[in-house]
Interface confidence: low
C-alpha cells in the first residue's frame, strides 16, 4: 500500500490521543532502556509502512499483536485516514484470522512494541537524522 496519500495530521492526532497510551499500557512494567531501537524510518509514509508491517505481520516469536488495543486503533486510523487502505487489507485480515494463536505477551512481542514506539515517535518527528 502506498501511504503517501494519508492524512498524516489526523493519524498523528489519533496516535497522540489514544494509540500512544495503549502502547505505554502494553509496555507497562518494562524499562524504557530494555530494548534498542533497530528499526527506523525517514518520511511519514515510510514510517507508516514500517508501523503497518510490525503491527500486523506476525513474526517469529510474536504472532499476536494484531488483536491488541493499540493495533486495532492503528488499523482504524489507517482505514479512516488512508484512502483505499481498507480494501488492500481484506485478504490479509482473513488470512490472519485463520492463523490466530492464543494471546501471549512474549519478550519478543515487548521488543516489537518497543520498536513500534520508536517508529511512532519518528512519525511525529520525521526526517532521517543519520547519513
Amino acid at each position: 500500500y502506498d501511504f503517501t496519500n494519508c492524512d498524516f495530521e489526523k493519524i498523528k492526532a489519533a496516535y497522540l490521543s489514544t494509540i500512544s497510551k495503549d502502547l505505554i499500557t502494553y509496555m507497562s512494567g518494562t524499562k524504557s532502556t530494555e530494548f534498542n531501537n533497530t528499526v527506523s524510518c525517514s518520511n511519514r509514509p515510510h514510517c507508516l509502512t514500517e508501523i503497518q508491517s510490525l503491527t500486523f505481520n506476525p513474526t517469529a516469536g510474536c504472532a499476536s499483536l494484531a488483536k491488541e488495543m493499540f493495533a486495532m486503533k492503528t488499523k482504524a486510523a489507517l482505514a479512516i485516514w488512508c484512502p483505499g487502505y481498507s480494501e488492500t487489507q481484506i485478504n490479509a485480515t482473513q488470512a490472519m484470522k485463520k492463523r490466530r494463536k492464543r494471546k501471549v505477551t512474549t519478550n519478543k512481542c515487548l521488543e516489537q512494541v518497543s520498536q513500534l514506539q520508536g517508529l511512532w515517535r519518528r512519525f511525529n518527528r520525521p526526517l532521517l537524522k543519520q547519513q
Epitope: T4, S42, P45, H46, R125, P126, L127, K129
Partner: antibody, heavy 117, light 107 residues
Framework: EVQLVQSGAEVKKPGASVKVSCKAS????????MHWVRQAPGQGLEWMGM????????TLIQKFKDRVTMTVDKSTSTAYMELSSLRSEDTAVYYC??????????WGQGTTVTVSS | DIQMTQSPSSLSASVGDRVTITCRAS??????LAWYQQKPGKAPKLLVY???TLAEGVPSRFSGSVSGTDFTLTISSLQPEDFATYYC?????????FGGGTKVEIK
C-alpha cells in the same frame, strides 16, 4: 500566513565569516525542520544541511562540516547559518526552507553573499 | 549519495505546448521526489511532492508521475507564466540532492 524572512545581502572578504538569519512566523517553529540550500550564480541548488529546532540537532553534508554552524533561537523563532573561512566560490544566494518530510513548502526570499577581495 | 539526473537541461516551447521533464535517480527512492519551479531572482516554489501530489495552489496543468527510478513532470498546456527553471529533488533521506535543472524557454 507562513513566512520565512531572511537577513539582507552581505559582502565579505575571503577568510571572513558570514551569519545569515531566517526568522519564521505563522507556524510552530519547533514542529518543522529548517534546511539551508545555496545557489551559486547561474548554477543549480545545493543542499547544505538541516537543523531540528526542537533540539538543535544538525546534519551537514561533508563538504560543509568544518565551516558551517547552524543554530536556532527558539525565543525569536529564528534560524541561523554561519559560514566561516569564506572563499570566492562561496558567492551564492543562501536560502532557508522549512520541511517536515524533506520537501520544502516554504522558502525564505534568499540572502546574497558576495565574497570578494 | 543519491544522484539525480535531470533532462533535458533546457528546452524551447510555445504557449499551449505539452512539456515533459524527466529526472532519474541513481537508486530506488520510491515516491520521495519533489519538483520546484524557479524564476530569476526568486526562491524556488514547490509544485509536486511524493512524486505525484500537487502542492497547494498549483494549477492542475502540472502533474507528476513515477516509473521505477524515473520521474516525470508534465505541463499539459504551457502558459506564459510557466517559462522558468524546474528542479527535481529527492527527499528519501540525507543528504538531499537536486537535479541540475531544466530551463524552459520561449520558442
Amino acid at each position: 500566513e507562513v513566512q520565512l524572512v531572511q537577513s539582507g545581502a552581505e559582502v565579505k572578504k575571503p577568510g571572513a565569516s558570514v551569519k545569515v538569519s531566517c526568522k519564521a512566523s505563522g507556524y510552530t517553529f519547533t514542529t518543522y525542520w529548517m534546511h539551508w540550500v545555496r545557489q551559486a550564480p547561474g548554477q543549480g541548488l545545493e543542499w547544505m544541511g538541516m537543523i531540528d529546532p526542537s533540539d538543535s540537532e544538525t546534519t551537514l553534508i561533508q563538504k560543509f562540516k568544518d565551516r558551517v554552524t547552524m543554530t536556532v533561537d527558539k525565543s525569536t523563532s529564528t534560524a541561523y547559518m554561519e559560514l566561516s573561512s569564506l572563499r570566492s566560490e562561496d558567492t551564492a544566494v543562501y536560502y532557508c526552507a522549512r520541511t517536515l518530510d524533506g520537501y520544502y513548502d516554504y522558502w525564505g526570499q534568499g540572502t546574497t553573499v558576495t565574497v570578494s577581495s | 549519495d543519491i544522484q539525480m539526473t535531470q533532462s533535458p537541461s533546457s528546452l524551447s516551447a510555445s504557449v499551449g505546448d505539452r512539456v515533459t521533464i524527466t529526472c532519474r535517480a541513481s537508486e530506488n527512492i520510491y515516491s520521495y521526489l519533489a519538483w520546484y519551479q524557479q524564476k530569476p531572482g526568486k526562491a524556488p516554489k514547490l509544485l509536486v511532492y511524493f512524486a505525484k501530489t500537487l502542492a497547494e495552489g498549483v494549477p492542475s496543468r502540472f502533474s507528476g508521475s513515477v516509473s521505477g527510478t524515473d520521474f516525470t513532470l508534465t505541463i499539459s498546456s504551457l502558459q506564459p507564466e510557466d517559462f522558468a527553471t524546474y528542479y527535481c529533488q529527492h527527499h528519501y533521506g540525507t543528504p538531499w540532492t537536486f537535479g541540475g535543472g531544466t530551463k524552459v524557454e520561449i520558442k
